[in-house]
């Protein structure tokens, strides 16, 4: 019961996490900044992985997609890749874990197969969560690095004077959504891996016994009890018939014509 609960909870937590990773990837608010230092209008800029948006004090908002791939920073491309890999792995993990759920019966699927599928999906969730956390962290680092590099340096070029305005771009909501979602997916994956241990076929709680034919009437008691003859009492609990019952550990490797399996 505990195994089913752990597996089910792991699945739900991972599902929420992957939904969060998808949401974060699609969100525009990865970085945000108020640009008040102009005489026309107060401007609020926010940027995502796919487009940059500007919202004015009037409420007007314009978003422009990053249509060029060549002009984009390599770090942004890396973040995109990490998030997409995280989503793909998570989606496959979800698909696998649905069939692995103990509460769902599909044909005559063995517990060992479900255990393997649970472990596979768990590992996928862990990698998916790590990808999301890594992607969000790389983007956050990019924002911090950009701030320290843009120390209001002014330079003159073909088009006149260009001034890099040093203003701090703050972490957008998408970063926090991504971190939390990645963490949840990671936790869900760990739970699935833990559940896998409980799903694996359990060893029998008694040792298998091999029987040897004998002329005596021998009472065989599995579970480690010594076999005793039906004649008289064995008050001192001595080993009366050594050739009778043996545990698998004690059985010799060479075959015997008297052995019964």
């Amino acid at each position: 019961m505990a195994v089913t609960a752990c597996q089910g909870l792991g699945f739900v937590v991972s599902l929420i996490g992957i939904a969060g990773i998808i949401a974060a990837t699609c969100m525009d608010q990865w970085s945000t900044q108020d640009l008040y230092n102009n005489p026309v209008t107060a401007v609020f800029n926010y940027q995502g992985l796919w487009r940059s948006c500007v919202r004015e004090s009037s409420g007007f908002t314009e978003c422009r997609g990053y249509f060029t791939l060549l002009g984009l920073p390599a770090m942004l491309q890396a973040v995109r890749a990490l998030m997409i890999v995280g989503i793909v792995l998570g989606a496959i993990g979800l698909l696998v874990s649905i069939f692995a759920l103990k509460c769902i019966r599909i044909g005559s699927m063995e517990d060992s197969a479900k255990a393997n599928m649970t472990l596979t999906s768990g590992i996928m969730f862990i990698v998916s969560g790590l990808c999301a956390i890594a992607g969000v962290s790389v983007f956050a680092n990019m924002l911090v690095t950009n701030f320290w590099m843009s120390t209001a340096n002014m330079y003159t070029g073909m088009g006149g004077m260009v001034q890099t305005v040093q203003t701090r771009y703050t972490f957008g909501a998408a970063l926090f959504v991504g971190w939390v979602a990645g963490g949840l997916t990671l936790i869900g994956g760990v739970m699935m891996c833990i559940a896998c241990r409980g799903l694996a076929p359990e060893e029998t709680n008694y040792k298998a016994v091999s029987y040897h034919a004998s002329g005596h009437s021998v009472a065989y008691k599995p579970g480690g009890f010594k076999a005793s003859t039906g004649f008289g009492s064995n008050t001192k609990n001595k080993k009366i018939y050594d050739g009778g019952a043996r545990t698998e550990d004690e059985v010799q490797s060479y075959p015997s014509k008297h052995d019964y399996v």
């Epitope: 640009l35 026309v40 209008t41 800029n45 009037s58 314009e62």
Partner: nanobody, 119 residues
Framework: QVQLVESGGGLVQPGGSLRLSCAAS????????MGWYRQAPGKQRELVAG???????NYGDSVKGRFTISRDNAKNTVYLQMNSLKPEDTAVYYC??????????????WGQGTLVTVS
């Protein structure tokens, strides 16, 4: 790198008209604000007119009713239509744009200036 190309300046008689244009090119994500400033000899640089992406405009007191600013967002270009020009409008006119040029960075870019002489 972001470049600005200004054009349209020149010599005009009082009461005449001129149209200035300024096109931005380079790595541009958004241009929230585009505008024109001017600097007459011996004076400080002052705002002539500015326009946001959404069309919000702001004009300097001395040009209200005479100058009209407009922009083409698709072409990243701003225009300044100057009517009823006066000798005191003589100055170097500078294009100014606020450009979102990358992730977590924006630039304030100034053009090299175009001279407008009203005489």
């Amino acid at each position: 790198q972001v470049q600005l190309v200004e054009s349209g300046g020149g010599l005009v008689q009082p009461g005449g008209s001129l149209r200035l244009s300024c096109a931005a090119s380079g790595t541009i994500f958004n241009i929230p604000v585009m505008g024109w400033y001017r600097q007459a000899p011996g004076k400080q640089r002052e705002l002539v007119a500015g326009i946001s992406t959404g069309g919000t405009t702001n004009y300097g007191d001395s040009v209200k009713g005479r100058f009209t600013i407009s922009r083409d967002n698709a072409k990243n270009t701003v225009y300044l239509q100057m009517n009823s020009l006066k000798p005191e409008d003589t100055a170097v006119y500078y294009c100014n744009v606020l450009v979102i040029s990358g992730i977590g960075s924006h630039l304030e870019v100034w053009g090299q200036g175009t001279l407008v002489t009203v005489s």
